[in-house]
């Protein structure tokens, strides 16, 4: 339905985001916000998989909200924007804005961690450990396990974070979690526990006495 | 309020000419495509014409090709029909409309009636 | 001969919902969205459903619009006197370079 038939030069993409956040808890208001370079006629959301758009909204300006009520985890999916002007012509619109995916849900998927190079080290080396989500922009928290505040944070524009772990204190077990950077806050389940050890120490546990 | 007022109706003989115009206002008319469309009596519509991209995209459709000519003067917020060539199936109530994707405004028409 | 295809009339009784349907191709309803307008006897054209689902202020929401495929369809429920009139899809169509509508449905509100 939506094809531009003229110079793409002439129908540039907007720009689509979402308020509070692109990951939400359910029953929240989500506001999705496109935003064109130019000032526009009209403004069309459209969810992926559906022809028709979801949403229109009529503005004459560069700037469209669309709002989702109380979303549910079915309103989740993958989103863009299009804009068009009043004289582009007949079913003429920009190009499609970036996708923005709109994950709603109460607990995020449980990230990976792993050690780089590996789990065993020589003694009085740096180790780093890969905390690994599938959505980017999150904040990261490594913990040791037996400690109850997390060793590091990191805010990653990643779908990932490597924390680093400096010489002798570095065998023990750990493991992390993230979460959304802002409020409303949606937290991940922690990861599985991953055991660091010095060479030839074989499975001593260093947790004991920290 | 957005309106939209034919006129240059009439009756003319097959063969003939006629200027049709249609007055806008209530909006920015040189922001707008435009198109006219016709209603042979007691028939279904039919689009006749539509102009684009202030005036650089111009579409008619096949039965008027050749004869008929849109135009438009965003100075004066009017568009234009300019017929030539006149035939009976071109009789007709001819009807201007705002066409920024659907003709979202209409006029209430003007009458062409092509007969000797 | 209309490029889009509609049954030439319908008809129900008050409170009831009707439906109506416009078949065309590729070229038009199925790469461009559907327009809906509604023509009361003796006026101009207004414009009541368009891209496919979508309602102007103002028109109530007992009009719906769908498209499936190369087809699209006009739905009244809760259908009233004042829905007598005739009802016209229209479509942009890429080969022809126009704009076409359907032969247009009048519809009667029976009874």
């Known amino acids: 339905d939506f094809t531009p038939t003229a110079p793409l030069a002439s129908y540039p993409q907007p720009w689509l985001g979402a308020h509070p956040a692109a990951v939400v808890t359910p029953g929240i208001n989500v506001t999705l916000t496109c935003r064109a370079p130019q000032s526009a006629w009209r403004f069309a959301l459209f969810k992926s998989g559906l022809v028709t758009p979801l949403l229109l909204r009529d503005v004459s300006v560069e700037l469209a909200e669309f709002f989702l009520e109380e979303v549910t985890p079915a309103q989740g999916g993958s989103y863009h924007c299009r804009y068009r002007k009043t004289d582009w012509g007949p079913g003429v619109w920009s190009q499609p804005s970036n996708v923005l995916e709109l994950l709603v849900t109460d607990q995020l998927p449980r990230p990976s961690l792993v050690a780089l190079p590996g789990p065993v080290v020589a003694p009085g080396a740096n180790v780093s450990l890969r905390c690994a989500g599938r959505i980017p922009g999150m904040s990261f928290a490594l913990y040791r396990v037996g400690v109850a505040t997390p060793l590091q944070y990191i805010d990653s524009v990643q779908p990932w974070a490597d924390f680093l772990l400096i010489g002798t204190h570095t065998p023990g077990t750990y493991c992390c979690y993230y979460h959304t950077p802002s409020a409303p806050y949606v937290l991940s389940q922690r990861s599985q526990p991953l055991v660091i050890s010095f060479e030839g120490s074989g499975s001593l546990d260093y947790t004991q006495g920290n | 309020e957005v309106q939209l007022l034919e006129s240059g109706g009439g009756l003319v003989q097959p063969g003939g000419s006629l200027r049709l115009s249609c007055a806008a206002s209530?909006?920015?008319?040189?922001?707008?495509?435009m198109s006219w469309v016709r209603q042979a009596p007691g028939k279904g519509l039919e689009w006749v014409s539509g102009?684009?991209?202030?005036?650089?995209?111009?579409y008619y459709a096949d039965s008027v090709k050749g004869r008929f000519t849109i135009s438009r003067d965003n100075s004066k917020n009017t568009l234009y029909l300019q017929m030539n060539s006149l035939r009976a199936e071109d009789t007709a109530v001819y009807y201007c409309?705002?066409?920024?994707?659907?003709?979202?405004?209409w006029g209430q028409g003007t009458l062409v009636t092509v007969s000797s | 001969q209309s490029v889009l295809t509609q049954p030439p009339s319908a008809s129900g009784t008050p409170g009831q919902r009707v439906t109506i349907s416009c078949s065309g191709s590729?070229?038009?309803?199925?790469?461009?969205?559907v327009t809906w307008y509604q023509q009361l006897p003796g006026t101009a054209p207004k414009l009541l459903i368009y891209?496919?689902?979508h309602r102007p202020s103002g028109v109530p929401d007992r009009f719906s619009g769908s498209k499936p495929g190369t087809s699209a369809s006009l739905a009244i429920s809760g259908l009233r006197s004042e829905d007598e009139a005739d009802y016209y899809c229209?479509?942009?169509?890429?080969?022809?370079?126009?704009?076409?509508f359907g032969g247009g449905t009048k519809l009667t509100v029976l009874g």
């Open positions: 229209g479509a942009w169509d890429s080969s022809l370079n126009g704009y076409v």
């Open positions: 891209y496919n689902s």
């Open positions: 590729s070229s038009n309803i199925g790469n461009n969205s």
């Open positions: 102009i684009y991209h202030g005036g650089g995209n111009i």
């Open positions: 409309a705002r066409a920024p994707d659907e003709f979202d405004y």
């Open positions: 209530g909006f920015t008319f040189s922001d707008y495509a």
